[in-house]
């Protein structure tokens, strides 16, 4: 399966240079810093440019969010890019690396009031990608800083799917995000096919768990495309 | 573990084409990203181009000449390369994406298959 991490034939992206920030040119891609060839033991270094496509922030690692590459660029393109460290800005949550969250448009650590024993942030989702403004849809959650320790829980309010107990992705549910079930086999799944629609989505399904992919249900074939149906079924 | 198969590769002239095609298993192939990469003898490999159903993506250097496509019901992926160059001699290696944070990887990466030669020259 894909889950095989250390598959000799693997090649994991780094993030871009230091002072690299999402819309402007050397932040685009990732370097990759080697290849281990099949059937040898030779480790060969190379800096080169990894783009990986993607259409929202759960196809990318944990590490990166999903955003087009330059400000000016193509629209219909976005990518993988490594995520913004702290006081970096952001537009959204995923922008910030783990342990960090974003906060009136700065990625802030998330660990700053722990000793106080919760934290207040403000959830600011806006309905578009990196280049729509701030404003979006704003409210106020008291978050619970155990959610930074121990894994939530289904129904737990989260920033990202690794805030999530195993089974668990972070996904939309009104303008929050709270900890759902990872998909099954033959569960109804979302299938993002134009640019952005995940955007709109104010009941954000999770993604199909390990060994299934999104695909229209074979009945459905013939059905127009915007009553089709999908569901996680097996590769 | 997924198994990529590359082939399409040969001898072709300076303005020629050639279609590479790189059939997948164990993989996503709906969901997420495949892509090619190549490397010239004594050259460090170089990423040509990706494709996912949220767009393709392609190095600047082969922009305009070089297609990425893929047919989800084969689970094969295509690079159409028209106006070859010699500079295009290279061996050309499929690479299918692994699926990011959905399978707990900090950075979305690629795995490789064995490559195919192409080689253009007069």
């Known amino acids: 399966t894909l889950n095989s991490v250390l598959n000799s034939n693997a090649i994991k992206n780094l993030p871009p240079p230091l002072g690299g920030a999402a819309g402007h040119p050397g932040s685009a891609v990732s370097a990759a810093p080697g290849i281990l060839y099949p059937g040898g033991n030779k480790y060969q270094t190379i800096d080169n440019y990894q783009p990986y496509p993607c259409a929202e922030d759960e196809e990318c690692g944990t590490d990166e969010y999903c955003a087009s590459p330059t400000r000016g660029g193509d629209a219909g393109v976005q990518i993988c890019l490594a995520c913004r460290k702290r006081r970096k800005r952001c537009m959204r949550h995923a922008m910030c690396c783990p342990g960090n969250y974003c906060k009136n448009g700065i990625c802030v650590s998330s660990d700053q009031n722990h000793f106080r024993g919760e934290i207040e942030e403000t959830i600011t989702e806006s309905f578009g990608n990196d280049h729509s403004t701030l404003d979006g849809y704003s409210r106020r959650t008291t978050l619970s800083s155990k959610m930074y320790h121990t894994k939530g829980q289904e129904g737990s309010v989260c920033l990202r799917s690794s805030d999530c107990a195993s089974g668990l992705c972070c996904a939309r549910h009104f303008w929050s995000k709270i900890c759902k079930p990872v998909l099954k086999e033959g569960q109804v799944c979302t299938k993002h096919r134009r640019k952005g629609s995940h955007g709109l989505e104010i009941f954000q399904r999770c993604y199909c768990g390990e060994g299934l992919s999104c695909r229209i249900q074979k009945d459905h074939h013939q059905a127009s495309n915007s009553s089709r149906l999908h569901t996680c079924q097996r590769h | 573990e997924v198994q990529l198969v590359e082939s399409g590769g040969g001898l072709v002239q300076p303005g020629g084409s050639l279609r590479l095609s790189c059939a997948a298993s164990g993989h996503t192939f709906n969901t997420y990203p495949m892509g090619w990469f190549r490397q010239a003898p004594g050259k460090e490999r170089e990423f040509v181009a990706a494709v996912s159903y949220s767009g393709s993506y392609y190095a600047d250097s082969v922009k305009g000449r070089f297609t990425i496509s893929a047919d989800n019901s084969k689970n094969t992926a295509y690079l159409q390369m028209n106006s070859l160059k010699p500079e295009d001699t290279a061996v050309y290696y499929c690479?299918?994406?692994?699926?990011?944070?959905?399978?707990?990887?900090?950075?979305?990466?690629?795995?490789w298959g064995q490559g195919t030669l192409v080689t253009v020259s007069s």
């Open positions: 690479a299918a994406g692994n699926g990011g944070r959905a399978y707990g990887y900090s950075r979305a990466r690629y795995e």
